[in-house]
């Protein structure tokens, strides 16, 4: 009977029905497991740890974008428990390739040492 329930559902013994696992709120992630018919007795939601965020539901908390360290960009908006960080323009000494599709992270800045002549962010 349990296996008839979906990914985020548990089998409710009282009603004999599949029931939605309680979704977490923004800034929280599931603690222990719930789904496919079973629910851990102590299943619940816990706040995201530092430097991570979640939009809620059944998502685990994810690390904020590292604008400066990974993307070599300025921080437009720092992340909090509910929102990812937003990156701004490239750091000094870095530039963004024009007319290039953004990757899954949105943007990456490249060192001016590799820039073509007259790249505006690298002039001067």
């Amino acid at each position: 009977e349990y296996s008839n329930c979906g990914e985020n559902e548990y089998y409710n013994q009282t009603t004999g029905l599949c029931q939605e696992c309680p979704p977490c709120g923004p800034g929280e992630e599931p603690y222990l497991s719930c789904g496919y018919g079973t629910k851990d007795e102590d299943y619940g939601c816990v706040p995201c740890p530092a430097e991570k965020f979640s939009k809620g539901g059944y998502q685990i908390c994810r690390r904020h974008k590292d604008c400066e360290g990974f993307f070599r960009a300025t921080v437009l908006t720092p992340g909090d428990m509910e929102n990812d960080a937003e990156c701004g323009p490239c750091l000094p000494g870095y530039y963004m390739l024009e007319n290039r599709p953004r990757n899954i992270y949105g943007m990456v800045c490249y060192s001016c040492l590799l820039a073509p002549p007259n790249t505006k962010e690298c002039v001067g």
Partner: antibody, heavy 118, light 108 residues
Framework: QVQLKQSGPGLVQPSQSLSITCTVS????????VHWIRQSPGKGLEWLGV???????DYNAAFISRLSISKDNSKSQVFFKMNSLQADDTAIYYC????????????WGQGTLVTVSA | EIVLTQSPTTMAASPGEKITITCSAS???????LHWYQQKPGFSPKPLIY???NLASGVPARFSGSGSGTSYSLTIGTMEAEDVATYYC?????????FGSGTKLEIK
């Protein structure tokens, strides 16, 4: 096949109680819940409560103080009782049930038109 | 409680026309818990679509359902005279179970 048949009075005096019986066939009351829903004249559908297969109940908070749902599994009967009826309780009262692991109203009784009037 | 808002409240359509009725929930509902019913005057409601997109037994294939989250819809691919009725959405996610206020479909 699955059937739900309702029996109960059509006329109830103000402040009196309403009793309706829903007799089911084609499934076991020990396995499935039976819901009660009403529809006031010209209005929409209002969920009142449910008795689950295991015998526990859930009620709409607006009716919890005057509503009681019980059952007799061996007779395949569910009993609905609402106290202290007033004119605005005039409605068609339905029992309904489901099958499978999700709670949708796959089967409905024929409805009992209840008029609250002196 | 979860409030379901249906639109439009009433509508008239010509035979052969495509009809869409929407149901908006006040909070997120998993698609497994949203259902649709058809009611004709003098009759009990009849199950139409369960779990968002599954046709109940005997329901013509011109009916379909879709949606997720807080936004769901019922579509009649080509309106027929026998489709004149009131349509209700319903959620089975939480207690109390709730219904939309209904959409009355008439024929032009």
């Amino acid at each position: 096949q699955v059937q739900l048949k309702q029996s109960g009075p059509g006329l109830v005096q103000p402040s009196q109680s309403l009793s309706i019986t829903c007799t089911v066939s084609g499934f076991s009351l020990s396995n499935y819940g039976v819901h009660w829903i009403r529809q006031s004249p010209g209005k929409g559908l209002e969920w009142l409560g449910v008795i689950w297969g295991g015998g526990s109940t859930d009620y709409n908070a607006a009716f919890i103080s005057r509503l009681s749902i019980s059952k007799d599994n061996s007779k395949s009967q569910v009993f609905f009782k609402m106290n202290s009826l007033q004119a605005d309780d005039t409605a068609i009262y339905y029992c309904a049930s489901y099958y499978g692991y999700y709670d949708w109203f796959a089967y409905w009784g024929q409805g009992t038109l209840v008029t609250v009037s002196a | 409680e979860i409030v379901l808002t249906q639109s439009p409240t009433t509508m008239a359509a010509s035979p052969g026309e495509k009809i869409t009725i929407t149901c908006s929930a006040s909070s997120i509902i998993s698609s497994n818990y949203l259902h649709w019913y058809q009611q004709k005057p003098g009759f009990s409601p009849k199950p139409l679509i369960y779990r968002t997109s599954n046709l109940a037994s005997g329901v013509p294939a011109r009916f379909s359902g879709s949606g997720s989250g807080t936004s769901y819809s019922l579509t009649i691919g080509t309106m027929e005279a026998e489709d004149v009725a009131t349509y209700y959405c319903q959620q089975g996610s939480s207690i109390p179970r709730t219904f939309g206020s209904g959409t009355k479909l008439e024929i032009k």
